[in-house]
């Protein structure tokens, strides 16, 4: 057992927050400022991520964990661990390489990110347009034109009761 222990890598005893220092007989040295090691037995510490420019510090770097960034107001995170920040636009716009551009006629975007999407085509469901679409909002489809013939009620009957937790298909 003793023999096995002596054959073991001495670096395996170095805990997170330290590194195995080859220059000092493989003793465990604390990670220098602005660096970290998140696991034991490491021979180097990793440089802390710096949240610069558009990136804001969400969590400071410690000796055992990297800093975490998010994006400054007017931008949103993209990618694993907020590796990128992307510009927000106004509702009714989409981001292009030419900056934020208004949605083309017939399309809308109700969020500050993402692309403009086509208005719903009510006629595909045999319905009519109840409320026109805008750059910021989709159209609202109403009853089919046939339902709006004289004498026909334009009020949609209540939907059958659904069990809680079930959404319409």
């Amino acid at each position: 057992f003793e023999r096995t222990r002596s054959l073991q890598d001495p670096c395996s005893n170095c805990p997170a927050g330290t590194f195995c220092d080859n220059n000092r007989n493989q003793i465990c040295s604390p990670c220098p400022p602005n660096s970290f090691s998140s696991a034991g037995g490491q021979r180097t510490c990793d440089i802390c991520r710096q949240c610069k420019g558009v990136f804001r510090t969400r969590k400071e770097c410690s000796s055992t964990s990297n800093a975490e960034c998010d994006c400054t107001p007017g931008f949103h995170c993209l990618g694993a661990g907020c590796s990128m920040c992307e510009q927000d636009c106004k509702q009714g716009q989409e981001l292009t390489k030419k900056g934020c551009k208004d949605c083309c006629f017939g399309t809308f975007n109700d969020q500050k990110r993402g692309i403009c999407r086509p208005w719903t085509n009510c006629s595909l469901d045999g319905k009519s347009v109840l409320v026109n679409g805008t750059k910021e909002r989709d159209v609202v489809c109403g009853p089919s034109p046939a339902d709006l013939s004289p004498g026909a009620s334009s009020v949609t009957p209540p939907a059958p009761a659904r069990e809680p937790g079930h959404s319409p298909q």
Partner: nanobody
Framework: EVQLVESGGGLVQPGGSLRLSCGAS????????MFWFRQAPGKELEWVAN????????YYVDSVEGRFTISRDNAKNSLYLQMNSLRAEDTAIYYC????????????????WGQGTTVTVSS
Amino acid sequence: EVQLVESGGGLVQPGGSLRLSCGASGFTFSNYWMFWFRQAPGKELEWVANVNQDGSEKYYVDSVEGRFTISRDNAKNSLYLQMNSLRAEDTAIYYCARGGEGYSDSHYGTDVWGQGTTVTVSS
């Protein structure tokens, strides 16, 4: 280490000119879209201009179109912003940034930023 370092900021009178530079290191500069952003005191960060990998596509925010020119020198790993006819409202910290991998194909995000250089336009 991937790094962007801006320089060239300073105090200039209205109507004057400045040229900002951004030196890139630690990555293949010519593979990436590059950007200038700015943040005026008390305001949100604003996109100013961007340029594609070979400098053939350039885009500007409306407020600087015709006054500012973005350019790059891939041989020198450098990005530039020539600013003419400067106005008080151009006062800001100017940042150089790199478009993330896949920029303009799948997203419009930026991933590496410099520390910024301050431009003050005042008489």
